[in-house]
Amino acid sequence: TGADTEAVVCVGTACYTAHSGKLSAAEAQNHCNQNGGNLATVKSKEEAQHVQRVLAQLLRREAALTARMSKFWIGLQREKGKCLDPSLPLKGFSWVGGGEDTPYSNWHKELRNSCISKRCVSLLLDLSQPLLPSRLPKWSEGPCGSPGSPGSNIEGFVCKFSFKGMCRPLALGGPGQVTYTTPFQTTSSSLEAVPFASAANVACGEGDKDETQSHYFLCKEKAPDVFDWGSSGPLCVSPKYGCNFNNGGCHQDCFEGGDGSFLCGCRPGFRLLDDLVTCASRNPCSSSPCRGGATCVLGPHGKNYTCRCPQGYQLDSSQLDCVDVDECQDSPCAQECVNTPGGFRCECWVGYEPGGPGEGACQDVDECALGRSPCAQGCTNTDGSFHCSCEEGYVLAGEDGTQCQDVDECVGPGGPLCDSLCFNTQGSFHCGCLPGWVLAPNGVSCT
């Protein structure tokens, strides 16, 4: 395929592999994909450090890379026609394996907007500088390359493989060699964590003599979220060494018998697991599994636990985290209910105030009460509100309908009220006549 697995780092529930080879981004992704992974994500500073570690491992084994500034593909790409979004940490790029946008980014320089071709991201390594945790590889954006033409300074790529869980490395209580074969077809003798479904071949012996024993184990799920090999007791034990070789392969304490045999044991507060090697805390609450203010409560025999929430909170679907109880769903208030963290409060609608019989009750506010009326003239209280009225010759005015404004009867909608002259007055009007004319008894006509 033009790529060699040179390095592997397994941590948490993922393994990262670094490969050297001048491949295009598509070829690199295809290589990762064939073994069940994707080009690596770098979604946090922690993940950036894992990727840096696997690259450092690769560089220690790689004789000489051709470019001082070497680039390694990761799984961040932007499709053709999708434009740059400077407001986002990933600038419109997305991870090839899918998943949400993440806040972490480490761009090498300001990105140029270009929507006409697909763009891919690589990690930029300055090989003249040592790789330090404080100096994480920068993200460099550019063309994705094509078969035979990977792009300038592309020296390899990083894959990521995710797993249900990991097994602890097998502990040898005497001379021997363990070889792990991972589901992504990498063989290694030194893994900090070994992914689920890996095989382990154990060859016991000094190496120069014929090997006396060999064992085969699979990393499997022994019980929910418990990943183990199913081996019982330390492997390759030798009376010649007793507890002196690798602490007898024991996780904590090793106790020797007089006949060269030995047993593993645990410190106070821990118990020996079925593998007779590993120790686990007796108190499952010691790992603080409960979140969000939840208290960890031990179950019978101290084997299990449940999480308990404070007043006004309840466990979410994970049964580990506390979420606020929405007390308003039970309609405890007469009118408005406002949910608050750990509780609730009742509020009244406009025109009502707290009061009356019962918890959370509301009563009408008498807006027309003495000294309180918002109206310029007449005020009538209603349930939850009020309305203003005006004396004859005035109409309600103002944005809130509380003011009274004189009606200009001289420009009334029915046309002129007077035959000749019309004089508007506060709340009324009167008619007049031109010189030589007299106002008739009806107060409207001129004679």
């Epitope: 022994k222 019980a223 199913g230 599994p289 580990l320």
Partner: antibody, heavy 118, light 112 residues
């Protein structure tokens, strides 16, 4: 489709031993736990033990340890339950059951009736 | 070992009526991953048991939706919304959180 086919009924005398088989098909035999469950006449279900055929790893219920041996042959996709020093109280139906990825016992064999009588 | 108590021992039901079976465990079956490892099986007369509910509330493939499972860390309930004649048999609850796996004593559902 997934199938577990068990060997036929057995009648044994006290003190004898017996090996029941369970032939699996329709799934990756090596990658799933294979359990054995006992049901005494008119009684409930009891988990006896299990095997992971991929590497032969076994776990036993303490109640049955020493009396039963579980084994598997990857090449033929067959699991075995060996019962030694049979007693009348071993008279029961023995089921082989696949354990799935949700820790459920999702596929059951038809059961093998073992009668121990002098 | 985790011990469970199933009740009632026997449950006579009229077809079309609902039915409810309880199961109580000696310790919580809630794992720190948020999953409850409680299962329900039905053994019809003369047959092998069959899986009904996995991980407390999930319906197994091919099981009618009149069956439902619920509960907390130690107390669980299997409900049948409307019992049908084909539902007769012995119902078992089981835990697969901690070895050895254990089953409840069983509840015999019969038609009135």
């Amino acid at each position: 489709q997934v199938q577990l086919v068990q060997s036929g009924p057995e009648v044994k005398k006290p003190g004898e031993s017996l090996k029941i088989s369970c032939k699996a098909s329709g799934y990756a035999f090596s990658s799933y736990w294979l359990n054995w469950v006992r049901q005494m006449p008119g009684k409930g279900l009891e988990w006896m033990g299990r095997i992971y055929p991929g590497d032969g790893d076994t776990d036993y219920n303490g109640k049955f340890k020493g009396q039963v041996t579980i084994s598997a042959d990857k090449s033929s996709g067959t699991a075995y339950l060996q019962l030694s020093s049979l007693k009348a109280s071993d008279t029961a139906v023995y089921f082989c059951v696949r354990g799935d990825g949700y820790w459920a016992m999702d596929y059951w064999g038809q059961g093998t009736l073992v009668t121990v009588s002098s | 070992d985790i011990v469970m108590t199933q009740s009632p021992l026997s449950l006579p039901v009229t077809p079309g009526e609902p039915a409810s079976i309880s199961c109580r465990f000696s310790q919580s079956l809630l794992h720190s991953n948020g999953i409850t490892y409680l299962y329900w099986y039905l053994q019809k007369p003369g047959q092998s048991p069959q899986l009904l509910i996995y991980q407390m509330s999930n319906l197994a493939s091919g099981v009618p939706d009149r069956f439902s499972g619920s509960g907390s860390g130690t107390d669980f309930t299997l409900k049948i919304s409307r019992v049908e004649a084909e539902d007769v048999g012995v119902y078992y609850c089981a835990q697969n959180l901690e070895l050895p796996w254990t089953f409840g004593g069983g509840t015999k559902l019969e038609i009135k």
